[in-house]
């Protein structure tokens, strides 16, 4: 567990020509607030997908009134940090969306109105416990400068906030087998967890997730004895000239794996695949609980509060195995059609399509613009073998033959009313909702669901999206 912290340093016009008009005026004073949305992994989902790592809303900044004729300066910002608590491990790679919202405070019927001024997004690598990282992002003519960091909440420590520290049991030293935590010398580190299945007799580790073998043993889990003979086949060659003895039964005969483990022969010995809750060379060791941290790669451990009840690891996308120790190679199933390139991003699959093909799995064959007419003043746009019709306002469909009614799909959520507009559509939200599609509920106490609305609104305040 821990907290992602975001500090906004400035929001104002970016460098270069075309400085944006001030968002506030003497007639319509306004103030800014910010929303951050975090997702695990290097995600490429749309802005509307859930903020799986969490989201937060800033306080509202000071009221700002434009000075007539003056260029838009850096706008006054809310005080304090935006903090996004995370309950599980910090993923190390994450995607963010930071939105700058404007709250207009003019004499409007029904109270203030909100509109989205700018949205920036990015993908970053970040270790928990590290220093503040500085960033600059541009959205149109606006520029946002900010810093961010992830920090662990005690008792968690480490770059992923997965190691646990406990207060010392005695003032003089940590208990037997426990050492002080590096950043917190007055606390003690909880026991280390090696790679799942690492032999408790022949393997050891000094870093989480590793498995080093004692002399005489080998294999990823130190379950294979090192052979001293020169025999190369599993049972040894039958030729007497090699000087190798040929053992009779195979290593899996009689199934040496206890507790329902299944045996498979290896070049020198055997390996047991153990059921959940057992490990060791012959699956002889039981008593693993969630307290032992058996789930790797950010897996969530459920059950197993005592040694007699089995635990279950709920693996994040891209991992499998009883301890989430195996990375799933979903590209081996060749899901991308028509020669598309498969990218396994861990949290999701992506297909990079060859020119002339499109769709999530490159399943759509696109023609080019040759001999193709787009109706009602639409223009055919060609790009690397693909085509599409860019339709004039008020028309849609593959060939721009359909008259477009932007409100036909009922895009306004929660009872919002839709109005067709020359530039698209406008949603007039029902009381208690805000956002481009009335998708954000506003709660009376200022708290809000994710994504959230600005604090301090009363339930009866009608919301307008400008």
């Amino acid at each position: 567990a821990g907290v992602f912290e975001l500090q906004i340093h400035s929001f104002g016009p970016g460098p270069g020509p075309g400085a944006p008009r001030s968002p506030c005026s003497a007639r319509l004073p306004c103030r800014l607030f910010f929303r951050v949305c975090l997702k695990p992994g290097l995600s490429e989902e749309a802005a509307e997908s859930p903020c799986a790592l969490g989201a937060a809303l800033s306080a509202r900044g000071p009221v700002y009134t434009e000075q007539p004729g003056a260029p838009a300066p850096d706008l006054p910002l809310p005080d304090g940090l935006l903090q996004v608590p995370f309950r599980d491990a910090w993923p190390g790679t994450f995607s963010f969306i930071i939105e700058t919202w404007r709250e207009e405070l003019g004499d409007q019927i029904g109270g203030p109105a909100w509109s989205l001024l700018a949205r920036v997004a990015g993908r970053r690598r970040l270790a928990a416990g590290g220093p503040w990282a500085r960033d600059i992002q541009r959205a149109g003519a606006w520029e946002l400068r900010f810093s961010y960091r992830a920090r662990c909440e005690p008792p968690a420590v480490g770059t992923a906030c997965t190691r646990l520290c406990r207060p010392r049991s005695a003032p003089s030293r940590c208990g037997p087998g426990l050492r002080p935590c590096a950043p917190l010398e007055d606390e003690c580190e909880a026991p280390l967890v090696c790679r799942a299945g690492c032999s408790p007799e022949h393997g050891f580790c000094e870093q989480p997730g590793e498995c080093r073998c004692l002399e005489g043993w080998t294999g990823p889990l130190c379950t294979v004895p090192v052979s001293t003979s020169s025999c190369l086949s599993p049972r040894g060659p039958s030729s007497a000239t090699t000087g190798c003895l040929v053992p009779g039964p195979g290593p899996c005969d009689g199934n040496p794996c206890a507790n329902g483990g299944s045996c498979s022969e290896t070049p020198r010995s055997f390996e047991c695949t153990c059921p959940r809750g057992f490990y060791g060379l012959r699956c002889e060791v039981s008593g693993v609980t969630c307290a032992d941290g058996p789930c790797f790669n950010g897996g969530l451990c459920v059950g197993g509060a005592d040694p007699d009840s089995a635990y279950i690891c709920h693996c994040p996308p891209g991992f499998q195995g009883s301890n989430c120790e195996k990375r799933v190679d979903r590209c081996s199933l060749q899901p991308c059609r028509n020669g598309g390139l498969c990218l396994d991003l861990g949290h999701a699959l992506r297909c990079r399509c060859r020119a002339g093909f499109a769709g999530p799995r490159c399943e759509h064959d696109l023609d080019d613009c040759a001999g193709r007419a787009c109706a009602n003043g639409g223009t055919c746009v060609e790009g690397g073998g693909a085509h599409r019709c860019s339709c004039a306002l008020g028309f849609g469909g593959r060939d721009c033959r359909e008259r477009a009614d932007p409100c036909a799909a009922r895009p306004c959520a929660h009872g919002g009313r839709c109005y067709a507009h020359f530039s698209g559509l406008v949603c007039a939200c029902a009381p208690g909702y805000m956002g481009a599609r009335c998708e954000f509920p506003v709660h009376p106490d200022g708290a809000s669901a994710l994504p959230a609305a600005p604090p301090g609104l009363r339930p009866g305040d009608p919301q307008r999206y400008l």
Partner: nanobody
Amino acid sequence: DVQLVESGGGSVQAGGSLKLSCKSPTYTISSGYMGWFRQAPGKEREGVAAIYIGGSTTLYADSVKGRFTISADNAEKTVYLQMNTLKPEDSAMYYCAAQLRPNSAYHPLDGRKYNYWGQGTQVTVSS
């Protein structure tokens, strides 16, 4: 709670022998490592020998290889350390340690591996 009780320490001349015992009266350790550690005044704790209960692995520090032997009698809930050809540098407080549940964290001669310890027995070797 798991208790470990060491005995067998004492004073001996260089070249002599001692046999240390570590008994667990309250708990039968069916699998996992048990080890012997020692600490001389002003020095770091040092792993001496370890044995895997329920397996066949024994490990020794280089300084005692060929002179010390670790063994276990599970029926008696006891682990032994037979120390032969003792040297003055073997003088120290000797501690017995056990894993309550076996796991692979840390080398068997690393004290961090163990979560139960005895109170120790003193060994003094004079020249």
